[in-house]
């Protein structure tokens, strides 16, 4: 999946159903959601809160998806539900927890399958903070690469986040990937839900730092779809 830069976290081609025609540059999109860890979702926490009504996945937290609470329930009544872990049944990518995606009806680990696709942010989006890109956590980092490769500083070429120093992730910048800062509390983040109609995210942001999740700002709940703002917030 090195359609990207050198350090070691490139953007990969999205499977045709999500990313468009295979073979076209447009089929390669931004990176995977959240911090991807080989063993699952290391920083995932479960908040105790009232069910939040929603119309689409983007209105829910990183570890949630929007659906009817009962199977075959009224489609008009939807709430944010906890994401589904690895090996659980799914119908779409958004149902699976960060670090996983829906393949053949089952949530499988992006970590093992190198799925790093997102089509969330359009190329015209321009919020204030440095347009970091997100790339999945370095998966399958070999012993040799750990031993022999110095970690890249901000701006360094990378293929995966393990190529970057602590506090940085490997994220897309235009058509290659570079090390960018992991997002801090209050910084604008990108909700990584896949919506095929959106443009390529050529300025990926990193994921939110430890203890933070990318959630819609409270005062933006009533805003129109186009102006929803997500920021890194404490769990």
């Amino acid at each position: 999946t090195l359609n990207s830069v050198l350090n070691s976290n490139a953007i990969k081609n999205l499977p045709p159903p999500l990313g468009g025609a295979a073979g076209h540059p447009g089929s390669a999109v931004s990176a995977a959601p959240g911090i991807l860890y080989p063993g699952g979702n290391k920083y995932q926490t479960i908040d105790n809160y009232q069910p939040y009504p929603c119309a689409e996945d983007e209105e829910c937290g990183t570890d949630e998806y929007c659906a009817s609470p009962t199977r075959g329930g009224d489609a008009g009544v939807q709430i944010c539900l906890a994401c589904r872990k690895r090996r659980k049944r799914c119908m779409r990518h958004a149902m699976c927890c960060p670090g996983n995606y829906c393949k053949n009806g089952i949530c499988v680990s992006s970590d093992q399958n190198h799925f790093r696709g997102e089509i969330e942010e359009t190329i015209t989006e321009s919020f204030g903070n440095d347009h970091s890109t997100l790339d999945g956590y370095s998966r399958r980092t070999t012993l040799s690469s750990k031993m022999y490769h110095t970690k890249g500083q901000e701006g360094s070429v990378c293929l995966r986040s393990s190529d970057c120093a602590s506090g940085l992730c490997c994220a897309r910048h235009f058509w290659s990937k570079i090390c960018k800062p992991v997002l801090k509390e209050g910084q604008v983040c990108t909700k990584h839900r896949r919506k095929g109609s959106h443009g390529l995210e050529i300025f990926q942001r990193c994921y939110c730092g430890e203890g933070l999740s990318c959630r819609i700002q409270k005062d933006h709940h009533q805003a129109s779809n186009s102006s929803r703002l997500h920021t890194c917030q404490r769990h």
């Epitope: 090195l2 050198l6 081609n13 190198h114 399958r140 995966r160 910048h173 235009f174 058509w175």
Partner: antibody, heavy 117, light 107 residues
């Protein structure tokens, strides 16, 4: 049309310095990482390293780190590969190659470097 | 570093026949494999990029398959101007590494 035009062949002696160039056109130079690849006579290709012109960040193959330096001049959309002290074993064909989402899609025509005493 | 073992080192195929080149990686790289063609005196040309994606302008005679550690480049049918060296390149993990190359000759 994307083009990568490399500097002419060089004949050098061991211990001499050298800088070869790769002038690009037809695309926005700062939007793609530039790689350098070595091909010794009759041998396979070896990735030496790359640079992202946006902030000048580099990554090197450990095999070449410390022996070569990769740089760019954004004003002229040119990438450089340089040696401060050449060795006989540096004799090879050197290619610059543009990164496109991980793959090296456009290549320069190559610069042949001969190092002989 | 990820080691790419390419085979055969050389092969000769008659026009109209099928040529198959394999590349085995020392570790799982998902589908982050690229294939290049290099003719004498020329730089490599990208044929197929990650995800077994045929590059624009490359004839459909070229195809690739594989994921994980085993990858195959197939040329079917082979034509006279396919004489060249073919290389695999993994773009999964730094440093990028290439296979040793396969020399394809047309009988």
């Amino acid at each position: 049309e994307v083009q990568l035009l490399q500097s002419a062949a060089e004949v050098k002696r061991p211990g001499e310095s050298l800088r070869i160039s790769c002038k690009t056109s037809g695309y926005s130079f700062t939007e793609n990482t530039m790689h350098w690849v070595r091909q010794m006579p009759g041998k396979e290709l070896e990735w030496m390293g790359g640079i992202n012109p946006h902030k000048g960040g580099t990554s090197y193959n450990q095999k070449f780190k410390g022996h070569v330096t990769i740089s760019v001049d954004k004003s002229s959309s040119t990438a450089y590969l340089q040696w401060s002290s050449l060795k006989a074993s540096d004799a090879a064909m050197y290619y610059c190659a543009r990164d496109w989402l991980g793959a090296m899609d456009y290549w320069g025509q190559g610069t042949l470097v001969t190092v002989s005493s | 570093d990820i080691v790419l073992t390419q085979s055969p080192a050389s092969l000769a195929v008659s026009p109209g026949q099928r040529a198959t080149i394999t590349c085995i990686t020392s570790t799982d790289i998902d589908d982050d494999m690229n294939w290049y063609q290099q003719k004498p005196g020329q730089p490599p040309k990208l044929l197929i990029s990650e995800g077994n994606t045929l590059r624009p302008g490359v004839p459909a005679r070229f195809s690739s398959s594989g994921s994980g550690t085993d990858f195959t480049l197939t040329i079917n049918p082979v034509e006279a101007n396919d004489t060249a060296n073919y290389y695999c390149l993994q773009s999964d993990n730094l440093p990028y590494t290439f296979g040793q190359g396969t020399k394809l000759e047309i009988k």
